[in-house]
């Protein structure tokens, strides 16, 4: 069942079928005998009760006030009253844009990230049984889609998908043809969730070591799920049996990004491990960033300013 009209301020376009449904509908069925009344007030008039005799365009059902169609002079405040329950709406009927298939003021904007799932489904549950056919237009050009009852677009978004999509439902009522238009302004943007990966700490690190001892070089980064972090050293990685790349550790941050750290363990440090670059690289679709570690013999520490050392 169609949900009730809970928004107190409503803007609609002239010439389209429209309805108001009060929010105590289930209650109204229980109290069949209770008097239920609909009123309108506008500028000059105060609380005029509505009934089918007020206008051939108005229909009253259990819970619903229907307009066939709504017109500019329907602008005003509407009230539903039942016992001690009252619901009020302010209705603003705006002029139709005769030069377009939609009215700019009645457009729903949606932002979709490129390559993310993008869907438009033309549905109107309230008028469903009366709808003969439905067409979907992009920038007022009809799209040829298989299903003419509920045309649908389901795809991964591309920049070319940007535009105004209008679902137009055609329906008959009392021998007259009406249409209802729902338009979406779809803006396709770049993937906003990606960050530029950041390697934490200084770009160049001199590490004081002793020959024959072990050292653990820790490389940490803040990155996206698909970004990679790896160590590069020597001519061909893996040629030195004393060098081991430990398993990467990843922790998700509250923002949905990843804090990654990868340790390079060098055992039984020899002369060949000194004064060479051990590079840690983070790679993403945006490119690469690298930080370097150089092992320096503790005895040589005096030759290098203290601030360039890491433990």
């Amino acid at each position: 069942a169609e949900s009730c009209t809970s928004r107190p301020h409503i803007t609609v376009v002239e010439g389209e079928p429209f309805y108001l449904k009060h929010c105590s509908c289930s209650l109204a069925h229980e109290i069949e005998t209770t008097t239920k009344s609909w009123y309108k007030s506008s500028g000059s008039q105060e609380h005029v009760e509505l009934n089918p005799r007020s206008s051939s365009r108005i229909a009253l059902h259990d819970c619903v006030l229907e307009f066939w169609p709504v017109e500019l002079n329907d602008t005003g405040s509407y009230f539903f009253q039942m016992k001690n329950y009252t619901q009020k709406w302010k209705l603003n009927v705006i002029r139709r844009n005769k030069h377009s298939c939609f009215t700019e003021r009645q457009v729903t904007s949606k932002i979709v990230e490129v390559k993310k799932f993008f869907q438009i489904t033309c549905e109107n549950s309230y008028y469903q049984t009366l709808v003969n056919s439905t067409s979907l237009y992009k920038n007022c050009k009809k799209l040829l889609l298989e299903n003419n009852k509920n045309p649908t677009i389901k795809k991964n978004a591309e920049f070319e998908d940007q535009g105004y999509y209008s679902c137009v439902h055609f329906l008959h009522h009392n021998g007259k043809l009406f249409n209802i238009t729902k338009t979406f302004n779809i803006t396709i943007v770049e993937d906003r969730s990606n960050i530029v990966p950041v390697l934490l700490g200084p770009k160049l690190n001199h590490v004081a070591v002793e020959l024959g001892k072990n050292v653990r070089l820790n490389c940490s980064a803040l990155l996206n799920e698909e970004d990679v972090i790896y160590w590069m050293f020597g001519e061909e990685n893996g040629s030195d049996p004393n060098i081991h790349e430990e398993k990467e550790m990843r922790i998700m941050t509250p923002e949905g990004k990843w804090h990654a750290s990868k340790v390079l363990r060098i055992e039984n440090i020899g002369e060949s491990n000194l004064n060479v670059l051990y590079n840690c690289t983070v790679a993403s679709t945006g490119g690469t960033d690298t930080k370097s570690f150089i092992l320096v013999r503790k005895a040589d520490m005096a030759d290098i300013p203290g601030h360039v050392f890491t433990r």
């Epitope: 920049f159 770049e190 990606n194 530029v196 799920e225 698909e226 990679v228 790896y230 398993k247 990467e248 990843r250 990654a260 790679a283 993403s284 679709t285 945006g286 490119g287 690469t288 960033d289 690298t290």
Partner: antibody
Framework: QVQLVQSGAEVKKPGASVKVSCKAS????????ISWVRQAPGQGLEWMGW????????DYAQKFQGRVTMTTDTSTSTAYMELRSLRSDDTAIYFC????????WGRGTLVTVSS | DIVMTQSPDSLAVSLGERATINCKSS????????????LAWYQQKPGQPPTLLIY???TRESGVPDRFSGGGSGTDFTLTISSLQAEDVAIYYC?????????FGQGTKLDIK
């Protein structure tokens, strides 16, 4: 419109240099690295290297190390690839492309090296 | 460097039939931290730049017909065209973007039988 527009064809003598440009539009230039890929006549695709637009870092294939320079100008969203000491076997179409899986390509620039 | 080897070098398939191209990497392109395969497939027609078909080994690029699918993991991958159309005649390349230098397979030429 999202596109990469490359500079026109070049004819060069052996030993000379060539600089190919690639202008990006329709997306945030710094969000994607720019790779250069070449294709010799009737041959396959060869990755030459790439530049990270956001920090200027470059990574070149060993084969081109010392002979290639990749740069960017963020004010004009343009990437450049300069190849020096040209030889006849450098005759190829040079493509710029973005990201690490290459979802957007330039049309290619034909560089002919001939004496 | 990671070496990418495609097989076969050329392939002829009847219209409407299935075409399968294989790609093998000399070392894994599967990143254990996120379980993603850093492998893409491209189609190249004469006189045109390549176009991306598949990335992450099996994710179809927007606008690519669903007759194209990618599979495999680690070192062995396949590109499948479920029902060959005339417009699919092209050269197909796999590429790894796990480690630089990013490398391509030698290409597989696909024709109609």
């Amino acid at each position: 419109q999202v596109q990469l527009v490359q500079s026109g064809a070049e004819v060069k003598k052996p030993g000379a240099s060539v600089k190919v440009s690639c202008k990006a539009s329709g997306y945030t230039f710094s969000s994607y690295g720019i790779s250069w890929v070449r294709q010799a006549p009737g041959q396959g695709l060869e990755w030459m290297g790439w530049i990270s637009v956001y920090n200027g870092n470059t990574d070149y294939a060993q084969k081109f190390q010392g002979r290639v320079t990749m740069t960017t100008d963020t004010s004009t969203s343009t990437a450049y690839m300069e190849l020096r000491s040209l030889r006849s076997d450098d005759t190829a179409i040079y493509f710029c492309t973005r990201g690490w899986y290459f979802d957007l390509w330039g049309r290619g620039t034909l560089v002919t090296v001939s004496s | 460097d990671i070496v990418m080897t495609q097989s076969p070098d050329s392939l002829a398939v009847s219209l409407g039939e299935r075409a399968t191209i294989n790609c093998k990497s000399s070392q894994t392109v599967l990143y254990s931290s996120n379980n993603k395969n850093y492998l893409a497939w491209y189609q190249q027609k004469p006189g045109q730049p390549p176009t991306l078909l598949i990335y992450w080994s099996s994710t179809r690029e927007s606008g690519v017909p669903d007759r194209f699918s990618g599979g495999g993991s680690g070192t062995d991958f396949t590109l499948t065209i479920s029902s060959l159309q005339a417009e699919d005649v092209a050269i197909y390349y796999c590429q790894q973007y796990y480690r630089t230098p990013y490398t391509f397979g030698q290409g597989t030429k696909l024709d109609i039988k």
